[in-house]
Interface confidence: low
């Protein structure tokens, strides 16, 4: 058993039929010595008396809010949560496996630049009685600070008959060094509590590997005289690291016909303009990627040829 | 050339070669995300590689103040990786494919390090750790780890030279 936060404890249980469970001793936080009784949750049934209560925790029915009283007055609370281990593996019932970029990916994170700021998100089908707490650090043995905000519900989607809820959190490395080569990964730890079930999820990454720039901005077309060619121009996204002479992007320009089956013409360039042939009913799209490190491409920015 | 005495390097040449290094490093090991190499308990093997750290003056301001600190750090790293790519980690079994970019990568590392340090000048170089894994599978894993680490190193070096070429060239 260990303390998650004040008056909240996690009991780690091997979860199999007829498992013996864990013996837990609760102590009432009071100078009183006698006349103390214990109850569980909203029930008024007395579970025991005395300053300590010994319980055998085997299942969720044994978890919950234990309260000690004296003469009708509440003295203290202890909330017991369960963390299940099945076949040596901690349960992952609360979050959905996003399966990208690989199986058992519960947390996904992205950064728009090298400032040390990143956003992580996760999915669940659970809509109520759910809380998350997020901690992060750079490295684990001698951790350097990363500050995370509160996890917040960011989207709700309908998937067939099921609803899916997306939560996200924004974190910022306290002393980020955008120009340095990272040697220690960022560690993100999410504590998830659903009713009386506790689970924890972790992710480890370098900022450079989760970079995904915003799409290029101010995408414009300028027809070239007496030609089907146009000059496409764009700018670096506002959120990209500066100076751009140091934090450079490379771009992919695509001409796409109305039909998905039509051949796509693609041009790669380090410049912020390109000359392409604009076909009727086609659209021109541009996306960006770090010039020197192959992390994710941005989403496309698009304009119609017309 | 970036001579230790403090004269300016051939920023544009360094920029072109470092950008080529980036391309080669990624073509040598393009499997981003397919193998999480940090899960393989590899602390002792890749902890010794020289990293371009915060105090090494490789940020835009540090380069403006005095680029020599940063160039020395990059030179150290280039020599280190050049030695690793020439060691039995890469030359031993399993043999690299004939068209593997590792040979070209090795030559380009040497080329850039020579651009930074002409004959007769000596910067202190970091001792290469004795990494000689006995099993071919260990060697393969170590190659991947070294290449992933090299990708990060050359990306920072390429930024430095791109910025230098744009803002510090005479």
């Amino acid at each position: 058993i260990w303390e998650l936060k004040k008056d909240v404890y996690v009991v780690e249980l091997d979860w199999y039929p007829d498992a013996p469970g864990e013996m837990v001793v609760l102590t009432c936080d009071t100078p009183e010595e006698d006349g103390i009784t214990w109850t569980l949750d909203q029930s008024s049934e007395v579970l025991g008396s005395g300053k300590t209560l010994t319980i055998q925790v085997k299942e969720f029915g044994d978890a919950g809010q234990y309260t000690c009283h004296k003469g009708g007055e509440v003295l203290s609370h202890s909330l017991l949560l369960l963390h299940k281990k099945e076949d040596g593996i901690w349960s992952t019932d609360i979050l959905k496996d996003q399966k990208e970029p690989k199986n058992k990916t519960f947390l996904r994170c992205e950064a728009k630049n090298y400032s040390g700021r990143f956003t992580c998100w996760w999915l669940t089908t659970i809509s109520t009685d759910l809380t998350f707490s997020v901690k992060s650090s750079r490295g684990s043995s001698d951790p350097q600070g990363v500050t995370c905000g509160a996890a917040t519900l960011s989207a709700e989607r309908v998937r067939g008959d099921n609803k899916e809820y997306e939560y996200s959190v924004e974190c910022q490395e306290d002393s980020a060094c955008p120009a340095a080569e990272e040697s220690l990964p960022i560690e993100v730890m999410v504590d998830a509590v659903h009713k009386l079930k506790y689970e924890n999820y972790t992710s480890s990454f370098f900022i450079r590997d989760i970079i995904k720039p915003d799409p290029p901005k101010n995408l414009q077309l300028k027809p070239l005289k007496n030609s089907r060619q146009v000059e496409v121009s764009w700018e670096y996204p506002d959120t990209w690291s500066t100076p751009h002479s140091y934090f450079s992007l490379t771009f992919c320009v695509q001409v796409q016909g109305k039909s998905k089956r039509e051949k796509k013409d693609r041009v790669f360039t380090d410049k912020t303009s390109a000359t392409v042939i604009c076909r009727k009913n086609a659209s021109i799209s541009v996306r960006a990627q770090d010039r020197y490190y192959s992390s994710s491409w941005s989403e496309w920015a698009s304009v119609p040829c017309s | 050339r970036a001579v230790p005495g403090g004269s300016s390097p051939a920023w544009t040449q360094c920029q072109q070669l470092s950008q080529k290094l980036c391309t080669l490093a990624w073509s040598a090991h393009p499997l981003v995300g397919h193998m999480d190499l940090r899960e393989e308990g590899d602390e002792e093997t890749t902890n010794d590689v020289p990293h371009i750290q915060c105090g090494d003056g490789c940020d835009p301001q540090g380069l403006r103040d005095n680029s020599q600190f940063c160039l020395q750090r990059i030179h150290q790293g280039l020599i280190f990786y050049e030695k690793l790519l020439g060691s039995d980690i890469f030359t031993g079994e399993p043999s690299l494919l004939p068209d593997s970019p590792v040979g070209q990568l090795h030559a380009s590392l040497l080329g850039l390090s020579q651009l930074l340090q002409p004959e007769g000048h000596h910067w202190e170089t970091q001792q290469i750790p004795s990494l000689s894994p006995s099993q071919p599978w260990q060697r393969l894993l170590l190659r991947f780890k070294i290449l992933r680490s090299l990708q990060a190193f050359v990306a920072v070096a390429a930024r430095v030279f791109a910025h230098g070429a744009a803002t510090l060239s005479p």
Partner: antibody, heavy 120, light 110 residues
């Protein structure tokens, strides 16, 4: 107790500028997304702009894009809205509001508002 | 003007139950949570309900919100004179990537 106190409103001529401030107290300001929402006299609520906890990501309604700038100073627990090129249709009570968590929605606490009047 | 549609007014007598509707589209109410705000005369809006039907502490359970498809509603039972106010629905809009509000409903307690 969460408190948000706006200031900086007043009468300004079309084309003029104003800077609104919102002083926050009673919570860890740097952990929360913040928004500005306005309400024209006798009308409904219109979301104006939002900023993430660290100040990194900002977003604006189309009606104010390019003219208004949201910012924050986490060391001073203060949110700002710099309003330039003001128009008569910007006349409204401007509320600063806290996002529930690091996101910008839902808005769980609102200030009392500050009135901006754009008129010649 | 407003992405979400509300009736401009509603009324009821003390003790009665009244319902205020809010209609949107698949990009807002259809795919996101609905939030309701109460604005008493001359005051700032106050959060009444979020994530479709959760109430912040201090909001009486006479207020209950629900959602179905691209519509939502707020029901107030046991109407009291202090409930006289403007009520606004709001939701995140995936297309606009920002919150959108209804035009508000003025509730009068007769």
């Amino acid at each position: 107790e969460v408190q948000l106190l706006e200031s900086g409103g007043g009468l300004v001529q079309p084309g003029g500028s104003l800077r609104l401030s919102c002083a926050a107290s009673g919570f860890t300001f740097s952990n929360y997304g913040m928004s500005w929402v306005r309400q024209a006299p006798g009308k409904g609520l219109e979301w104006v702009s939002r900023i993430w906890p660290s100040g990194g990501y900002t977003k604006y309604a189309d009606s104010v894009k390019g003219r208004f700038t949201i910012s924050r100073d986490n060391s001073k627990n203060t949110l700002y809205l710099q309003m330039n090129s003001l128009r008569a249709e910007d006349t409204a009570v401007y509320y600063c509001a806290r996002g529930k968590g690091s996101g910008s929605f839902p808005l769980d606490y609102w200030g009392q508002g500050t009135l901006v009047t754009v008129s010649s | 003007q407003y992405e979400l549609t509300q009736p401009p007014s509603a009324s009821g007598t003390p003790g009665q139950r009244v319902t205020i509707s809010c209609s949107g589209s698949s990009s807002n109410i259809g795919s996101n949570f609905v939030t309701w705000y109460q604005q008493l005369p001359g005051t700032a809006p106050k959060l009444l309900s979020y994530t479709n039907n959760q109430r912040p502490s201090g909001v009486p359970d006479r207020f209950s919100a629900s959602k179905s498809g691209t519509s939502a509603s707020l029901a107030i039972s046991g109407l009291q004179s202090e409930d006289e106010a403007d009520y606004y629905c709001a939701a995140w809009d995936d297309n606009l990537n920002c919150p959108v509000f209804g035009g508000g409903t003025k509730l009068t307690v007769l």
